[in-house]
């Protein structure tokens, strides 16, 4: 059994040159003829030199999975899916995303350090002492209120609540 060169494929005991991206094998090589290739039909593709008898079906971006079509399929490139706004890719295979998750909402006591993108979740960070956040999409923690001279501090602020002041 011969070992074929890179970008050749084995047919019986012969090595045939592969087809170009965007094509598939229509007729394998013989003594006097090279590999005859045919263009991929619509909605199919081959991204690399190949010995495939059929092109691969183009991926479909499922809106129920939070996906939208970012780049249409071509004969030599699969469909590129992206997550809809507010979602990020959970399962990425090369440039193909199969499932999306909603961006994390920062809990009370935390602020948004890095906004979520189509391929990254939101990054949250704790509020420093003396500041608080109600969570959500807040990017800055707010400083606790300083009760005025005419007010009494009823409850000290926490990382998720402001100081509570009361009038005397």
């Amino acid at each position: 059994q011969p070992s074929c060169r890179q970008e050749e494929f084995l047919v019986g005991d012969e090595c045939c040159p592969m087809c170009n991206p965007g094509y598939h094998v229509k007729q394998v090589c013989s003594e006097h003829t090279g590999t005859v290739c045919a263009p991929c039909p619509p909605q199919t593709y081959t991204a690399h030199a190949n010995g495939l008898s059929k092109c691969l079906p183009c991926g479909v971006c499922d809106p129920d999975m939070g996906l939208l079509t970012w780049q249409e399929c071509s004969s030599w490139k699969d469909t590129v899916c992206r997550c809809i706004p507010g979602y990020f890719c959970e399962n990425q295979d090369g440039s193909h995303c199969s499932t999306c998750l909603q961006h994390t909402t920062c809990p009370p006591g935390q602020r948004v350090e890095k906004r979520g993108t189509h391929d990254q979740d939101t990054v949250c960070a704790d509020c420093l002492t003396g500041t608080f956040s109600l969570g959500g999409t807040q990017e800055e923690c707010l400083p606790w209120t300083n009760c005025s001279a005419f007010q009494q501090e009823v409850r000290r602020g926490t990382n998720s609540t402001d100081t509570t002041c009361s009038s005397q």
Epitope: Q6, Y23, G34, T35, V36
Partner: antibody
Framework: EVQLLESGGGLVQPGGSLRLSCAAS????????MSWVRQAPGKGLEWVSS???????YYNPSLESRFTISRDNSKNTLYLQMNSLRAEDTAVYYC?????????WGQGTLVTVSS | EIVLTQSPGTLSLSPGERATLSCRAS??????LAWYQQKPGQAPRLLIY???SRTTGIPDRFSGSGSGTDFTLTISRLEPEDFAVYYC??????????FGQGTKVEIK
């Protein structure tokens, strides 16, 4: 004697059309794949299209579906219909037998695309 | 597409000398490579197919070798009528069939 004779070339304006013919003699035309190869002035050879004996057709992807190859086995003739011609299509167009290596060539017909 | 690169671009030699022309493919084309000779104002003529098989009527001073990505056309002793442009062409994976840019063999 095995022979291929092209005709139909000439001067055409950009955007125009032209149909080239290639008359074959001296061999069983229907048994062979046939091809068109072109050569721009002072440049190298460029494959244009092939039609197999089965009737399957193949084109250079760079031509963007502007050309159509066909054959009439009863007339031993190969054709190339060229539409939406551009200045860069100016070349000598050769008809050749074969779809792999081209063993018989015609003398070529000059196509000039110019306004 | 498979790109064929021929070297040198021009070869200046005297009659009787040996000419060695190279053709390199961007990826393997197996043995499916042809060589053509073209003289000014004429159609190309097939010399070699299948990398090493001579076409009927081609003198044995022309020989081809190689497989995969590296190919050579050798003219053992140049005759005056051999000065011309030579093209390699792959048909290992088609379409598209592709040609090299050519090597001109000129008289020194």
């Amino acid at each position: 004697e095995v022979q291929l004779l092209e005709s139909g070339g000439g001067l055409v304006q950009p955007g125009g059309s032209l149909r080239l013919s290639c008359a074959a003699s001296g061999f069983t035309f229907s048994n062979y794949g046939m091809s068109w190869v072109r050569q721009a002035p002072g440049k190298g050879l460029e494959w244009v299209s092939s039609i197999y004996y089965s009737g399957d057709t193949y084109y250079n992807p760079s031509l963007e579906s502007r050309f159509t190859i066909s054959r009439d086995n009863s007339k031993n003739t190969l054709y190339l219909q060229m539409n939406s011609l551009r200045a860069e299509d100016t070349a000598v167009y050769y008809c050749a037998s074969g779809s792999n290596a081209f063993d018989i060539w015609g003398q070529g017909t000059l196509v000039t695309v110019s306004s | 597409e498979i790109v064929l690169t021929q070297s040198p671009g021009t070869l200046s030699l005297s009659p009787g000398e040996r000419a060695t022309l190279s053709c390199r493919a961007s990826r393997s084309v197996g043995k499916y490579l042809a060589w053509y000779q073209q003289k000014p104002g004429q159609a190309p003529r097939l010399l070699i197919y299948g990398a090493s098989s001579r076409t009927t009527g081609i003198p044995d001073r022309f020989s081809g070798s190689g497989s995969g990505t590296d190919f050579t056309l050798t003219i053992s002793r140049l005759e005056p009528e051999d000065f011309a442009v030579y093209y390699c062409q792959q048909y290992g994976s088609s379409p598209p069939v592709t040609f090299g840019q050519g090597t001109k063999v000129e008289i020194k």
